[in-house]
């Protein structure tokens, strides 16, 4: 990667981070009456998530994420869940590259939507701070 492509990657990661934080804030909104119900849904967590290729694990969970977000009141988000997830999907596909043979491995334990989002927020923050 060139310095310009790395800069683009950084910007994409910042967009991904903002999108994930927006979803988390929308879910945690005290006016969200569906939070208890949303927390019953389980998400697969990556066995490891330190590099861009591990975004394969996030990509595979975007559809379930969209389904859970459809439960929330739309006013909690600036965009419809379908559009929000579509935006994230475009970023993820660009970031992880076209290494289609790379298979995700998941941790043994599942997580709530809040734990899931926090994991990928932590991932985004760490890549932003260490990518050179």
């Amino acid at each position: 990667p060139t310095s310009s492509s790395t800069k683009k990657t950084q910007l994409q990661l910042e967009h991904l981070l903002l999108d994930l934080q927006m979803i988390l804030n929308g879910i945690n909104n005290y006016k969200n009456p569906k939070l208890t119900r949303m927390l019953t849904f389980k998400f697969y967590m990556p066995k490891k998530a330190t590099e861009l290729k591990h975004l394969q694990c996030l990509e595979e969970e975007l559809k379930p994420l969209e389904e859970v977000l459809n439960l929330a009141q739309s006013k909690n988000f600036h965009l419809r869940p379908r559009d929000l997830i579509s935006n994230i999907n475009v970023i993820v596909l660009e970031l992880k590259g076209s290494e289609t043979t790379f298979m995700c491995e998941y941790a043994d334990e599942t997580a709530t939507i809040v734990e899931f989002l926090n994991r990928w927020i932590t991932f985004s923050q760490s890549i932003i701070s260490t990518l050179t």
Partner: antibody
């Protein structure tokens, strides 16, 4: 058998440069993330840099802007270009393979870098 | 950055003893923890990954446990070749960080 063999260490003056190499064999080099980890005399281990299979590079604040990790998949080789060296960079530098889903599973024997005037 | 606090920093024990080394992460790292053994003048050797799984060839007397922030490495019956320094490491997120090490000495 997985093997990692480092070379290129030596004595260098503060402000100087050095290029470390790591020759890998026994696995599909291009599919793995590789890392450099260092150990100052009598001290613990410190992660220095990593490069993934797409050649994206990662490093901590302590060396960013001074150290550059790179790889040559055709030669099964990993490199660490170290510039603006300081006394505190004195250490044994290890090359390690980062398994895709787990820890640093194989390590080289290390190469010693001494920064002193 | 995630801090890994290892204790004790040194430990004296005898052959046949059961020894436990602990590692505490400054934040949740799931089970993304590895343990390494390093003998004087040698490079680190990977013992444990995912907090509790032994690498191939690692004797069964070595075991790891824990998740979240608290982790342990146990050697059930010390052998002469086990006297070395042991390090924990988190690989939950970059930058990878290691514990300060535990030097296991012969009593």
């Amino acid at each position: 058998e997985v093997q990692l063999v480092e070379s290129g260490g030596g004595l260098v003056q503060p402000g100087g440069s050095l290029r470390l190499s790591c020759a890998a064999s026994g696995f599909t080099f291009s599919s793995y993330t590789l890392a450099w980890v260092r150990q100052a005399p009598g001290k613990g281990l410190e992660w220095v840099a990593a490069i993934d299979s797409s050649s994206y590079t990662y490093s901590p604040d302590t060396v960013r802007g001074r150290f550059t990790i790179s790889r040559d998949n055709a030669k099964n080789s990993l490199y660490l270009q170290m510039n603006s060296l300081r006394a505190e960079d004195t250490a044994v530098y290890y090359c390690a393979r980062d398994s895709n889903w787990d820890a640093l599973d194989y390590w080289g024997q290390g190469t010693t870098v001494t920064v002193s005037s | 950055d995630i801090q890994m606090t290892q204790s004790p920093s040194s430990l004296s024990a005898s052959v046949g003893d059961r020894v436990t080394i602990t590692c505490k992460a400054s934040q949740n790292v799931g089970t993304n923890v590895g343990w390494y053994q390093q003998k004087p003048g040698q490079s680190p050797k990977a013992l444990i990954y995912s907090a509790s799984f032994r690498y191939s060839g690692v004797p069964s007397r070595f075991s790891g446990s824990g998740s979240g922030t608290d982790f342990t490495l146990t050697i059930s019956s010390l052998q002469p070749e086990d006297f070395a320094t042991y390090y924990c490491q988190q690989y939950y997120t970059y930058p990878y960080t290691f514990g300060g090490g535990t030097k296991l000495e012969i009593k």
